[in-house]
C-alpha cells in the first residue's frame, strides 16, 4: 500500500526497524495477518493507532494524526 511504484516491502517487528517516514504494521485489511512490513507514514488528519504511524512533524492524538504545533485535527 505504498504510494511509491515498485516499492519493496521490508519485513519488520517494530517501528524502530523502519525508516523515519515509515512504521511497522500488517498491510492487510483489519491487520489480522501475522506478517508485518514497513509502511509509509500517515499524513495529517489520517487515522492512527500510535505516534510512530504519523509522519514527522505530526503525532497521534485521539486516533488522528495531527500537527505537532496543533491541539486538534480540525
Amino acid at each position: 500500500y505504498q504510494t511509491i511504484d515498485n516499492y519493496q516491502p521490508y519485513p519488520c517487528a517494530e517501528d524502530e526497524e523502519c525508516g523515519t517516514d515509515e512504521y511497522c504494521a500488517s498491510p492487510t485489511r483489519g491487520g489480522d495477518a501475522g506478517v508485518q512490513i514497513c509502511l509509509a507514514c500517515r499524513k495529517r488528519r489520517k487515522r492512527c493507532m500510535r505516534h510512530a504511524m504519523c509522519c514527522p512533524g505530526n503525532y497521534c492524538k485521539n486516533g488522528i494524526c495531527v500537527s505537532s504545533d496543533q491541539n486538534h485535527f480540525r
Epitope: Y1, T3, G30, K46, C48, M49, N62, G63, I64
Partner: antibody, heavy 119, light 107 residues
Framework: QVQLVQSGAEVKKPGASVKVSCKAS????????INWVRQATGQGLEWMGW????????GYAQKFQGRVTMTRNTSISTAFMELSSLRSEDTAVYYC????????????WGQGTTVTVSS | DIQMTQSPSSLSASVGDRVTITCQAS??????LNWYQQKPGKAPRLLIY???NLETGVPSRFSGSGSGTDFTFTISSLQPEDIATFYC?????????FGQGTRLEIK
Amino acid sequence: QVQLVQSGAEVKKPGASVKVSCKASGYTFTSYDINWVRQATGQGLEWMGWMDPNSGNTGYAQKFQGRVTMTRNTSISTAFMELSSLRSEDTAVYYCARTDYFYFGMDVWGQGTTVTVSS
Amino acid sequence: DIQMTQSPSSLSASVGDRVTITCQASQDISKDLNWYQQKPGKAPRLLIYDASNLETGVPSRFSGSGSGTDFTFTISSLQPEDIATFYCQQYDHLPIAFGQGTRLEIK
C-alpha cells in the same frame, strides 16, 4: 457470518434525543472502526463520524459536533450513536458501517435504522 | 474539507452497454477513493476500494481507475441487476466525504 444488526425504527419529537445501537458479530469488534452514515429520503449519503471500539476514540463531522455522541460496550460488541436536539431535518435512515483504521472502505453495513422526527 | 463531485447525476443505459461514472475531488486524494452501490431500500455495498481494487465477491464487470483528483467507475456490460445509485467516497483524510450519487436506470 460477519454482520452488523441495528436497533429498530424510532419516532421522536423535535428537541428530543435518539440512541441507535449497532451489534457486531462474526469478527473481533475491537479490531475495526465503526462509522455512522445517514441518508434522508431520496438524498445521498452523509458521513457523521467514526469510533474506535478499542480505545473509545471518536471523530465527528463538523456539522454534528456538539449534538452527536458515539459510544460502545465492548462486552456486548455493540456501538451506539446518540443524536440530541433533534429537528425535522434529522429524519433519515441511520447506518452503522465497519471500516479498518486505514479507511479501505465500509465493507460491512448495518441494515439501517429509520428515525422520524415529527411533532 | 474535501468535496467530491460526481457526474452525471443520473443516466439511462441499455443492458450490455458500457457505463462510465466520474468522480472529481476538490484536491489531490492520491488513490484514497472507494465506490459503492446502493439499491433502493438497502444499505450501500462496497464495490471498489483504493480507486481500483475489486472488493471480494464483486463481479469483474465493475472496475475503477484514477488517482489524484479524477476518478472513473466503469461497468463493462450493464446487467439488469446493476440498477442502483452509485457513490464515490474519499478517505484521504477526515472528514470522510461522499459524492452526491449517480442514479443508473435501464433504458
